[in-house]
Interface confidence: low
């Protein structure tokens, strides 16, 4: 490690004094210090002498001696104060540039260490430092503003108390640059545009960045458009805006528009599509099947997608029957806008009642006319069953009526003993009726079928059961012959209550 003579960490001299700094190392040595006048350098092998015979306040600073050949990179330093009663500060730079959150060193070096107790940092014109300005002072290096912020870009002065007065340094301009996180932020408005030929249109491309140095342009189908640029600064961001105004659009204006912005960090682009149409349009569609089947008591949401330009002038849901003249409650109708030209309308039908089966129509209107989309809602019901004993053409017959939707299937069971429901162990005989007679089958209503079981003689210690089932559920009715006639048993549970 080189050695400096005099072997003191700091040296205090008066202006005009002669100063000699000698550095000795094992090999050749070099001096490094603040740029200042009047120094003479003399090198002789492993020693180097820095001297002046007229020291000034500008010679104040730290002088470092290094040995370039030393693999450990050792160095020695001495700090020189030239205490000038009229010049307490030696300012090494009048402009300091840092990025946000870096420490900013304002290099005003104190020329007299005795003054350290009365130093302060101020903004020019006697303004106080901004609140939360966190700074420290080193007489060797100056003031350091820690984690500098953009707003702290100001002109500063170093102040020292000399003879009861505040003596300021020349001003130091601090420029705190925003750290540019990436390419400029972009917005292109609208995200999609539709116009009828002859209408006016506006497309706005804007870019913003913490730094003013960026470019922005708008292009149509890869052709750059010449548009005047508006510039602004707010919320600590620079903004550049390009506005394309079209008084009367035509088909050649249609196509892809891209907003592109770039800076040193790279490029950002965003696009939108402009459609020009001959006339107004209104299209209704649904992702759902227009024919809906739902079990009674359950809920259903009917959804209609609307694509329209110009915007809708009116819309509503209507119940077209056949059961009642009720209309859907407005509170159950919901509209959501996917984007400017596409909307979704939903009708919520919770806990459906029998009287709510039927046709539901969504109607919408815009300058292009009226459009409607109709859903057909059929309710599913589990079967209801009843059995009676009758004579048909002189023959004793059990007549089973089953009502439900979808159309129920019918099965007859004969079992031993008297029971409300035949179980497997008791079953004596089973008959499937693949084609029961359909008694009624109207749209949106239950289907009622009838099945006949001809019985020559009723066995008194036996039960005859009619079972019906469909995709929703099943129902049954037990018929128990008794000596005085016949006795019927509906199931213990009444399986369906509308």
């Amino acid at each position: 490690i080189p050695v400096i003579e005099p072997s003191v960490p700091e040296l205090v001299v008066k202006p005009g004094a002669t100063v000699t700094l000698r550095c000795v190392g094992n090999g050749s040595v070099e001096w490094d210090g603040p740029p200042s006048p009047h120094w003479t350098l003399y090198s002789d092998g492993s020693s180097s002498i820095l001297s002046t015979n007229n020291a000034t306040f500008q010679n104040t600073g730290t002088y470092r001696c290094t040995e370039p050949g030393d693999p450990l990179g050792g160095s020695a330093a001495i700090h020189l104060y030239v205490k000038d009663p009229a010049r307490p500060w030696n300012v090494l730079a009048q402009e300091v540039v840092v990025f946000e959150d870096q420490d900013a060193l304002l290099p005003c070096l104190l020329t007299d260490p005795v003054l350290e107790a009365g130093v302060s940092l101020v903004r020019v014109r006697g303004r106080p430092l901004m609140r939360h300005t966190n700074y420290s002072f080193s007489p060797w290096h100056g003031f350091t503003i820690h984690r500098a912020k953009f707003i702290q870009s100001q002109d500063y002065q170093c102040s020292a108390l000399m003879g009861g007065r505040k003596v300021m340094s020349i001003s130091i301009r601090l420029k705190v640059q925003k750290v540019i996180p990436g390419p400029p932020a972009l917005t292109l408005v609208p995200a999609e545009l539709v116009r009828i030929r002859g209408e006016a249109a506006q497309i706005v491309c804007s870019a913003s960045s913490v730094d003013v140095n960026f470019d922005v342009f708008l292009q149509h189908n890869n052709t750059k458009l010449a548009i005047p640029q508006q510039s602004d600064f707010h919320n600590n961001r620079y903004q550049k805006v390009l506005t394309l105004n079209l008084d009367q659009v035509d088909f050649q204006h249609a196509g892809n528009y891209s907003c592109v912005a770039s800076n040193v960090q790279g490029k950002h682009s965003t696009s939108m599509f402009f459609r020009v149409v001959e006339s107004a349009y209104l299209n209704l569609s649904s992702e759902q099947n227009l024919i809906q089947e739902v079990t009674v008591g359950e809920g259903l949401n009917l959804k209609v997608m609307v694509e329209a330009y110009p915007g809708l002038q009116g819309f509503n849901w209507t119940y077209l029957g056949p059961f009642s003249d009720h209309q859907p409650e407005p509170k159950l109708a919901n509209a959501t806008t996917k984007d400017t030209y596409r909307h979704t309308f939903t009708l919520s039908l919770p806990r459906l009642k029998p009287s709510e089966a039927g046709r539901y129509s969504f109607l919408a209107r815009n300058p292009g006319g009226w459009r409607a989309l109709t859903f057909e809602l059929t309710l599913r019901y589990p079967p209801e069953v009843s059995v009676i004993w009758t004579f048909i053409n002189g023959s004793g017959t059990l007549l089973c009526a089953a009502s439900g939707y979808p159309q129920p299937n019918v099965t007859w069971l004969q079992c031993s003993g008297h029971t409300d429901r035949c179980d497997e162990a008791q079953v004596l005989q089973v008959w499937d009726d693949p084609y029961p007679e359909v008694l009624s089958q109207e749209p949106f209503h239950k289907v009622t079928v009838q099945s006949l079981l001809t019985v020559e003689t009723l066995e008194h210690n036996q039960t005859y059961e009619c079972r019906a089932h469909n995709s929703v559920g099943s129902g049954s009715w037990a018929f128990i012959p008794i000596s005085a006639g016949a006795h019927t048993h509906p199931p213990d549970e009444f399986l369906f209550t509308p």
């Epitope: 006697g126 106080p128 901004m130 609140r131 939360h132």
Partner: antibody
Framework: EVTLKESGPALVKPTQTLTLTCTFS??????????VGWIRQPPGKALEWLAN???????YYNPSLKNRLTISKDTSKNQVVLTMTNMDPVDTATYYC??????????????????WGQGTMVTVS | DIQMTQSPSSLSASVGDRVTITCLAS??????LAWYQQKPGKAPKLLIY???SLQDGVPSRFSGSGSGTDYTLTISSLQPEDFATYYC?????????FGGGTKVEIK
Amino acid sequence: EVTLKESGPALVKPTQTLTLTCTFSGFSLTTYGMGVGWIRQPPGKALEWLANIWWDDDKYYNPSLKNRLTISKDTSKNQVVLTMTNMDPVDTATYYCARIGPIKYPTAPYRYFDFWGQGTMVTVS
Amino acid sequence: DIQMTQSPSSLSASVGDRVTITCLASEDIYDNLAWYQQKPGKAPKLLIYYASSLQDGVPSRFSGSGSGTDYTLTISSLQPEDFATYYCLQDSEYPWTFGGGTKVEIK
């Protein structure tokens, strides 16, 4: 204990010069960062800042009155003096002196009026 | 000069009420703002400095907030001794300027 007390004439004639003295104790105006200021308040109206003087003899005046105001200090007597020339009836007010409390390094030496005198009423008539 | 606009100029409130007084500066004053309380015939008393720092000995029901150009003095629960006139003061830039004052009266 910090105390300040204003003294001066209760009545002055228009065009005359007003001289007010603020005598203080409990602090020294040689202490780094210390200051004393003058403030006035016309009857029923808001406060108006007039002038400041700092430990290092730095002086600041309200520009609307600057040519009429002079502030000075006598640290040996613990006094600050304010003179106001060419007095007018609109200058009728209660005049207060107040201490600007010290802030030690590394915070910049600027603060607010933390201790006030009781005020002295000056009528210009 | 920086103008300080204080509002309201007066208000009526009851003991226990929460009271808010605002000061609007004509330009950024970087939190260099103080709040004072003045009772009739008395000198002003420092309550808050640096916009939000509570002066020693001032009850904690007083608080200051704000930044940039907008600042607020809040009394969380008004006490009988709080009925007075309140002033703000900016010392960001010379000339130092006071607000027009807010008189807090008993409802």
